[in-house]
């Protein structure tokens, strides 16, 4: 019997300072570019080496970005989301959702809060 794959979803506020080459990541998603089935949310698809996001270290590929400077990213066209980031200013606050894959055994698996493996 195979183990079950579960996901641990957490949210985090990430404050980035725009670097010389910008924020340093790519996005996918939007109402006209659904990257995840039945979800028009905005996701991080690429973290650029030595960019602001990479140097900060918290934003990860696969993260869902929920808001930028308090502005919700729900129901946006892809290009509108891109423009929102580009016009977000020097100090940018991102509310992000991390989705961590947790491999659980078929029986008697430990809870996710148990640090012992």
């Amino acid at each position: 019997m195979n183990g079950r794959v579960d996901y641990l979803v957490t949210e985090e506020e990430i404050n980035l300072t725009r670097g010389p080459s910008g924020l340093g990541f790519n996005i996918v998603g939007g109402t006209d570019q659904q990257y995840v089935s039945n979800d028009s949310g905005i996701y991080v698809s690429r973290i650029k080496e030595n960019g602001a996001a990479a140097l900060d270290g918290r934003l990860q590929e696969g993260d869902k970005i929920l808001s930028v400077n308090g502005q919700d990213l729900k129901n946006l066209l892809h290009q509108d989301a891109v423009d929102l980031f580009r016009n977000a200013g020097y100090a940018v606050s991102l509310r992000v959702q991390h989705r961590l894959q947790v491999q659980n055994g078929p029986i008697g698996h430990r809870g996710e809060g148990d640090p012992s493996g």
Partner: nanobody, 129 residues
Framework: QVQLVESGGGLVQAGGSLRLSCADA??????????MGWFRQAPGKEREFVAH????????YYADSVKGRFTISRDNAKNTMYLQMNSLKPEDTAVYYC?????????????????????WGQGTQVTVS
Amino acid sequence: QVQLVESGGGLVQAGGSLRLSCADAASGRTFSTYTMGWFRQAPGKEREFVAHINWDGSNTYYADSVKGRFTISRDNAKNTMYLQMNSLKPEDTAVYYCAAAIGSTVDSYRHSDPLEYDYWGQGTQVTVS
């Protein structure tokens, strides 16, 4: 995983035309999220930017040397990008590479920077005599 394969290169006389294709043999439905470009490299020279296209084809950008002669396009239903090359010149002789990055940069476009792209094809030779 992304697997870009170019085709359509060959030998053509000056003034002639060629159409290059770049297909992703592996992506499936994610192709439509790629930002893509064409680059070329002539013997003894550095890799040179040729053209760029955004995810849905609504935004294109060209090097000055090919503007008005080359046209970049894409068909997301076929997982393929194209480069229509007209009025070819001997100086267009090079190996042509397609490149892709997943998603759109949230920063100012730097289409011509190879570091903006994560995935590259193996190249197709274009020779203009």
